[in-house]
Interface confidence: low
């Protein structure tokens, strides 16, 4: 087998050889990637933007945050790409999933509710390794306990019930700006993966002691960027090759 | 069809600390939105419910009013509830109840309201 | 903390009479994001724990007779016993589980007349 004596070949040139070969294949593996998108977008050259932009453009929450300080490093460093790679050639990946519109949503007490969300097939019920939903607190003015529940809508049963629990949290607020709070759901995910069409969408409740309710689930003026969002981070492993 | 029952000592003295064990049984209570509640009742009054925990996340919250003399814990292997309340005065002798919202995923948010009650445990606080 | 205020504290009614007990909260147990009231009655004979018979205000717990029925919104509600049966002989307790802490009424005493 051409491949596997290719690999024998490195490892008995040493560590660093090997590093570099994976790190020559997997960067012209990437950039063939990046050919073929820009040919589907029928562009000669990668747009040119910068940060701000992005920062401008994206949820100002924490993980998004973290993805571009890491790829304006990246960048720097004249490194590659937004996935991760260990020993078993496992790549991860981090899909950012927004809201969007869903009719069933739109129906439920004739006002529009938060959040439906549609899903990439990448994301695939047995490849998601973490899924966080992450909603934004808006500040309170005296310190306060609030009470978060993110409840999964179901079709109406004889009863009229519409919702089924999630998950629910307990938190301390104090006075200042407000919070990302991000909850698991991965649970949630994987059935909804298994079963799209119980993907009707979640509502999101989130009440201060006074009963007011803190979650920016439809932005208001002054917060673009702050609606609720999926972050879900998938892997795929592919059997591990033997030596 | 889930039942609970709660246990602990018919009498305790003023200052102790009283602990009252409520213990699911029939069902299980592992499926997201499981809420169980302690509320007590003086003899002849009113009800007053004292704390919550959500049954497969670490949620808890007391009466704001009781909350320095309030813990309450579980242990998810032995399907129990644990309540435990310091320096016990006269005025708590009541009848305590564990009360739980059966499929309170389908009814709305929190637990809010209790169709599942253990028969309840009287305590005397007496010297 | 909302303080559930029921009146009257005893009321006689005879068999086959309607029976009204109401309910105030000091503040609103409405949650206008799911449109509900997080209000639910009980009934409690001696002896025995609280048995749930209304919650949202209005909707019925499975097995309860429709004699019973609640109504109201916001911060004022009923519970109405249609037609009064020689077992509904007990204490009516409304309780709001809309914000912590969760707070029970007094009580009303329903008797026969």
């Known amino acids: 087998n051409e491949n596997s004596e290719q690999k024998e070949n490195v490892e008995k040139e040493g560590l660093c050889n090997a590093c570099t070969w994976r790190q020559n294949t997997k960067s012209s593996r990437i950039e063939a990637i990046k050919i073929q998108i820009l040919s589907k977008l029928r562009l000669e050259t990668a747009p040119n933007i910068s940060k701000d932009v992005i920062r401008q453009l994206l949820p100002k929450a924490p993980p998004l945050r973290e993805l571009i300080d890491q790829y304006d490093v990246q960048r720097d460093d004249s490194s590659d790409g937004s996935l991760e790679d260990d020993d078993y050639h496992a790549t991860t990946e981090t899909i950012i999933t927004m809201p969007t519109e869903s009719d069933f949503l739109m129906q439920v007490d004739g006002k529009p509710k938060c959040c439906f969300f549609k899903f990439s097939s990448k994301i695939q019920y047995n490849k998601v390794v973490k899924a966080q939903l992450w909603i934004y607190l808006r500040p309170v003015e005296t310190p306060t306990t609030v009470f978060v529940q993110i409840l999964r809508l179901i079709k109406p049963m004889k009863d009229g019930t519409r919702y089924t629990g999630i998950r629910s949290l307990k938190l301390d607020m104090n006075p200042g700006t407000g919070i990302w709070q991000s909850i698991d759901v991965k649970t949630v995910l994987q059935n909804w993966l298994k079963q799209p069409e119980s993907n009707l969408g979640i509502e999101i409740k989130a009440l201060d002691e006074n009963g007011h309710d803190l979650a920016v689930t439809f932005p208001g003026p002054g917060e673009d960027g702050l609606n609720p969002f999926l972050e879900v981070k998938v892997t795929d492993t592919p059997k591990r090759s033997r030596r | 069809q889930v039942t609970l029952r709660e246990s602990g000592p018919a009498l305790v003295k003023p200052t102790q600390t009283l602990t009252l064990t409520c213990t699911v049984s029939?069902?299980?209570?592992?499926?997201?939105?499981?809420?169980v509640n302690w509320i007590r009742q003086p003899p002849g009054k009113a009800l007053e419910w004292l704390a919550m925990?959500?049954?497969?996340?670490?949620?808890?919250v007391y009466n704001s009013a009781l909350k320095s003399r309030l813990t309450i814990s579980k242990d998810t292997s032995k399907n129990q509830v644990v309540l435990t309340m310091t320096n016990m005065d006269p005025v708590d002798t009541a009848t305590y109840y564990c009360?739980?919202?059966?499929?309170?995923?389908?009814?709305?948010?929190?637990?809010?309201?209790?169709?599942?009650w253990g028969q309840g445990t009287m305590v005397t606080v007496s010297s | 903390d909302i303080v559930m205020t029921q009146s009257p504290d005893s009321l006689a009614v005879s068999l086959g009479e309607r029976a009204t007990i109401n309910c105030k909260s000091s503040q609103s147990v409405l949650y206008s994001a799911d449109n509900k009231n997080y209000l639910a009655w009980y009934q409690q004979k001696p002896g025995q724990p609280p048995k749930l018979l209304i919650y949202d205000a209005s909707s019925l717990e499975n097995g309860v007779p429709d004699r019973f029925s609640g109504s109201g919104s916001g911060t004022d509600f009923t519970l109405t016993i249609s037609s009064l049966q020689a077992e509904d002989v007990a204490v009516y307790y409304c309780?709001?589980?809309?914000?912590?802490?969760?707070?029970f009424g007094g009580g009303t005493k329903v008797e026969i007349k």
């Open positions: 029939g069902g299980s209570l592992s499926s997201g939105g499981s809420y």
């Open positions: 309780q709001q589980g809309h914000l912590f802490p969760y707070s």
């Open positions: 009360a739980h919202r059966q499929n309170v995923d389908s009814y709305g948010y929190w637990g809010d309201a209790f169709d599942i």
């Open positions: 925990t959500d049954w497969d996340a670490d949620n808890i």
